[in-house]
Interface confidence: medium
Amino acid sequence: DAHKSEVAHRFKDLGEENFKALVLIAFAQYLQQCPFEDHVKLVNEVTEFAKTCVADESAENCDKSLHTLFGDKLCTVATLRETYGEMADCCAKQEPERNECFLQHKDDNPNLPRLVRPEVDVMCTAFHDNEETFLKKYLYEIARRHPYFYAPELLFFAKRYKAAFTECCQAADKAACLLPKLDELRDEGKASSAKQRLKCASLQKFGERAFKAWAVARLSQRFPKAEFAEVSKLVTDLTKVHTECCHGDLLECADDRADLAKYICENQDSISSKLKECCEKPLLEKSHCIAEVENDEMPADLPSLAADFVESKDVCKNYAEAKDVFLGMFLYEYARRHPDYSVVLLLRLAKTYETTLEKCCAAADPHECYAKVFDEFKPLVEEPQNLIKQNCELFEQLGEYKFQNALLVRYTKKVPQVSTPTLVEVSRNLGKVGSKCCKHPEAKRMPCAEDYLSVVLNQLCVLHEKTPVSDRVTKCCTESLVNRRPCFSALEVDETYVPKEFNAETFTFHADICTLSEKERQIKKQTALVELVKHKPKATKEQLKAVMDDFAAFVEKCCKADDKETCFAEEGKKLVAASQAALGL
């Protein structure tokens, strides 16, 4: 399937609109600090060049790889060294090292201002004045803040973003129509970004085999009626798509994702009965719908797993002949029978099975050795079940905010060296597992909760990797992808931590807190809570609860005061004194 000109091939496959959007995303994800106008200029230059190649594939430079073309273009940016420092050194390298170098400099936490939402009328005017620029700016702002955002999915978000403005800017009450839609897109976007970040981390840190194992388990749960060969084909194609997107090959990724959606819809009879509605939708909606489709019903008469994987005398023979295929079949068979298990649990079971076979197939009596392998699964299954039960009970007792606070305290005591903003962000997201998953019946709780926690803990891992401060975090993040959550769960209070010096400035608050949204006010309070624990890591739950109650009363009191700033200054001193007394300082 070789083409004389790769850039012409992708331009023709994707069409000009998607081509330009994807190149903009790619550039913004690489050069996250560059102004919007600079990126638009680069994209226009690449697009004009692509058009010349479409007209004549033999034209000069049209035979170059996309990495070469895009890398050359990025390296023309005049301020590269001043803005990006050592990233400019990438430009001295040849492909493929140059692209690898750009990838390594992607920043999961770029120093960019928070996106402030303008007034609805201002947004609607901007949308009407120049729709194309308005939508490009959306792609640019999301892509530079989320350098691993799944590019074809970002096109889907942009389509919904456009639809929201098209509808709501004509509505009688623009704000009532638009704001909930924008909130939904923002929340879904953050979730989508985090999920994709885990896929990329899986591929980049643990390799293709780890990603394929994850995909086998998840697709087998989703398509339990599909044959193993069918699931294997989908896994291979899906791995290619995500490898490309995570590697910055966004044009190839989007093209291959469209091909995969087409294949799935053409073969839905042998894949899943749940795909019909998805397959009637336009391309971007179709791909999104397939990715989110509910699990198909399990075939009625699936035989016991033990026959093929424990009782059979051919277990070691089959394993030796093709280890990964045999383990893949085990994972497929187990996963299609267990939509009630998290993917990470299924992968732990498969790893236990693999370890047992490695040991037993070299033993004098292999069958005797692996006969009880399924008994080893019981504690692995019960551990997340018990953890979820306990935490859902705690969530139901406390509500989301106080549950987040309990997790903040728990995680700050485990890894107090981690920066306060990271602990707040991660613990808030961990706490959202309650409202997201505890409402589900037992059969759906574990896949919802544990796979969500994997996504959130990956955020901690990628943020920590940028500036490593805790050996314990590094250990949990790097030793095993599937055991990250149990590793963090098992961490106790870090006894080696030297408490932070008390700094009154950290606990000084001003009247601006009164005008913050409820969410922002919570974050302020939770930031103070983390600092409190870092300052007094041995504080009891009751002590911390007491101080936080005092803090809430203080904010409530001063926000009702006539002279708020004076109240915050005077009452703040009393609060600090009372808090120090409460904590025995």
Partner: nanobody
Framework: DVQLVESGGGLAQAGGSLRLSCAAS????????MGWFRQAPGKEREFVAT???????SYATSVQGRFTVSRDIAKNTVYLEMNNLKPEDTAVYSC?????????????????WGQGTQVTVSS
């Protein structure tokens, strides 16, 4: 000076309810926190619940969801509604009044105390 008088204690079955009252006289408490504490035989006095001048309410974890503190400013009275009582709730319950909005969960945060009322929960 300030006088605090508790009432409403007595004997209750496990799972039952009681309502304690704390009437204050001497001067008003619009700028202070009023709280309930309890002391079981051989144990230290422990925090139960408080209501502050702002109306902000706090509970000890052990009673959260079972006990409700409220006040009637006109009557200068604070109440403690106790539901789903357990044998471990058996203690002398005292009412306190403090002059600061902070530290309402520590005995040292209170300047005035009532004489207490006995609550006994049988299983």
């Amino acid at each position: 000076d300030v006088q605090l008088v508790e009432s409403g204690g007595g004997l209750a079955q496990a799972g039952g309810s009681l309502r304690l009252s704390c009437a204050a006289s001497g001067r008003t408490f619009s700028n202070e926190c009023m709280g309930w504490f309890r002391q079981a035989p051989g144990k230290e006095r422990e925090f139960v619940a408080t209501i502050r001048s702002t109306g902000h309410i706090s509970y000890a974890t052990s009673v959260q969801g079972r006990f409700t503190v409220s006040r009637d400013i006109a009557k200068n009275t604070v109440y403690l509604e106790m539901n789903n009582l357990k044998p471990e709730d058996t203690a002398v319950y005292s009412c306190g009044a403090g002059v600061s909005d902070y530290g309402c969960y520590r005995t040292s945060g209170y300047n005035y105390w009532g004489q207490g009322t006995q609550v006994t929960v049988s299983s």
